[in-house]
């Protein structure tokens, strides 16, 4: 896991601002497989490449998210970029972080997890990142990932880095993060739950 997400991000980051805008508009009307919902227009149009990548992965999971991205790129006439994306995702499905088993995303739970729904707010408003990292260490984050997040200079960049690992997490892993958020900044969770 993670390889497809990185490939999607690479593709989207290589789009011009105008192309990214066009990509989003096409995403609003592209045919979807049965059982998949559409990313809400309001949220979609304001996203940067990184936010959009995370949204694609959280809505459609990595494999279908990459396939969908390639279809939209092809529809835009960007065949070479679509081909590169598909080639990158077919190099191997990738693995969960060394030694940490991340089972497939739970299909039993409908909709988005709280941490995916409120990604932008959490990046902007979480201040006690160290608390979260300590709670997730070993259980969800490898030592390497843990140190990578800590190395970031600001709380928002720490949280952004932390969120770069979440596409490989299942629902239970995300629950661990939510639980840690409740312990460290319960008022923030309550505020977001009300919003």
């Amino acid at each position: 896991m993670g390889r497809a997400r990185d490939a999607i991000l690479d593709a989207l980051e290589n789009l011009t601002a105008e192309e990214l805008k066009k990509f989003k508009l096409k995403l609003l009307s592209v045919p979807l497989r049965e059982g998949y919902g559409r990313i809400p227009r309001g949220a979609l149009l304001s996203m940067d490449a990184l936010d959009l990548t995370d949204k694609l992965v959280s809505f459609y999971l990595e494999t279908y998210g990459a396939e969908l991205t390639a279809n939209v790129l092809r529809d835009m006439g960007l065949q070479e970029m679509a081909g590169q994306l598909q080639a990158a995702t077919h190099q191997g499905s990738g693995a969960a972080p060394a030694g940490i088993q991340a089972p497939p995303q739970s299909a039993a739970k409908p909709g988005l997890h709280f941490i995916d729904q409120h990604r932008a707010a959490l990046i902007a408003r979480v201040t006690n990142v160290e608390w979260l990292l300590d709670a997730l260490y070993g259980k969800v984050l490898t030592d390497e990932q843990y140190q990578a997040v800590r190395a970031e200079p600001t709380n928002p960049s720490k949280m952004r880095k932390l969120f770069s690992f979440t596409p490989a997490w299942n629902w239970t892993c995300k629950d661990l993060l939510l639980q840690a958020l409740r312990e460290s900044q319960s008022y923030l969770v309550e505020d977001l739950e009300r919003s």
Partner: antibody, heavy 117, light 107 residues
């Protein structure tokens, strides 16, 4: 009450292997990690490695890679450490320790290992 | 690896004394420092975690402080049961490392 009960003293021959256990009680085993620490005679403490029970994730001190192997059995709430190719310098007390939020909070009583021919 | 140094290997004090044991790290450890007590019978227990947080069941006469590379454990009113060896340990970076220990004795 949190408890970590370690297996009894071992006397083994050089070149052999040993597997010591750490039976836990008083907490949800799968929510924590178990670390192992060595204390050689008349010396201080040295970290060997740890295992997170929920996912089997392990990290080892480079010095002990190939020497120690950490495993666990969730059905009996027990963590294990196997030491291989034993030599006299492996004679020591070995502690298992619960990890909570990356720090060690509760220690076992220690298992004494003597390697002698 | 981060080296943890306890410069005083043994310390003698009288009952009721205020005792301070110091520990220094070879690089900054962001307050990720624990203090452990090992009794003469070998049992080990956590006293202080994250530099200054008192572990449950530990008497309030124990306290910890420090930042960056320099840390200390203070026992404000020495009691007979405090006879032990005290170890600091960093958990900032792998491999997690311990100081060499400070053996506390009663005068």
């Amino acid at each position: 009450e949190v408890q970590l009960q370690q297996s009894g003293a071992e006397l083994v021959r050089p070149g052999s292997s040993v597997k010591m256990s750490c039976k836990t009680s008083g907490f949800t085993f799968t929510s924590y990690g178990i670390s192992w620490v060595i204390q050689r005679p008349e010396q201080g403490l040295e970290w060997i490695g740890y295992i997170y029970i929920r996912n089997g994730y392990t990290e080892y001190n480079e010095k002990f890679k190939g020497k120690a192997t950490l495993t666990s059995d969730t059905s009996s709430n027990t963590a294990y450490m196997q030491l291989s190719n034993l030599a006299s310098e492996d004679s020591a007390i070995y502690f298992c320790v619960r990890i909570h939020r990356r720090f060690f909070d509760y220690w076992g009583q220690g298992t004494t290992l003597t390697v002698s021919s | 690896d981060i080296q943890m140094t306890q410069t005083t290997s043994s310390l003698s004090a009288s009952l009721g004394d205020r005792v301070t044991i110091s520990c220094s790290a070879s690089q900054g450890i962001s307050n990720y420092l624990n203090w452990f007590q090992q009794k003469p019978n070998g049992t080990v227990r956590l006293l202080i975690y994250y530099t200054s947080s008192l572990h449950s069941g530990v008497p309030s006469r124990f306290s910890g402080s420090g930042s960056g590379t320099d840390y200390s454990l203070t026992i404000s009113n020495l009691e007979p049961e405090d006879i032990a060896t005290y170890y600091c340990q960093q958990y900032d970076r792998l491999p997690w490392t311990f100081g060499g220990g400070t053996k506390l004795e009663i005068k």
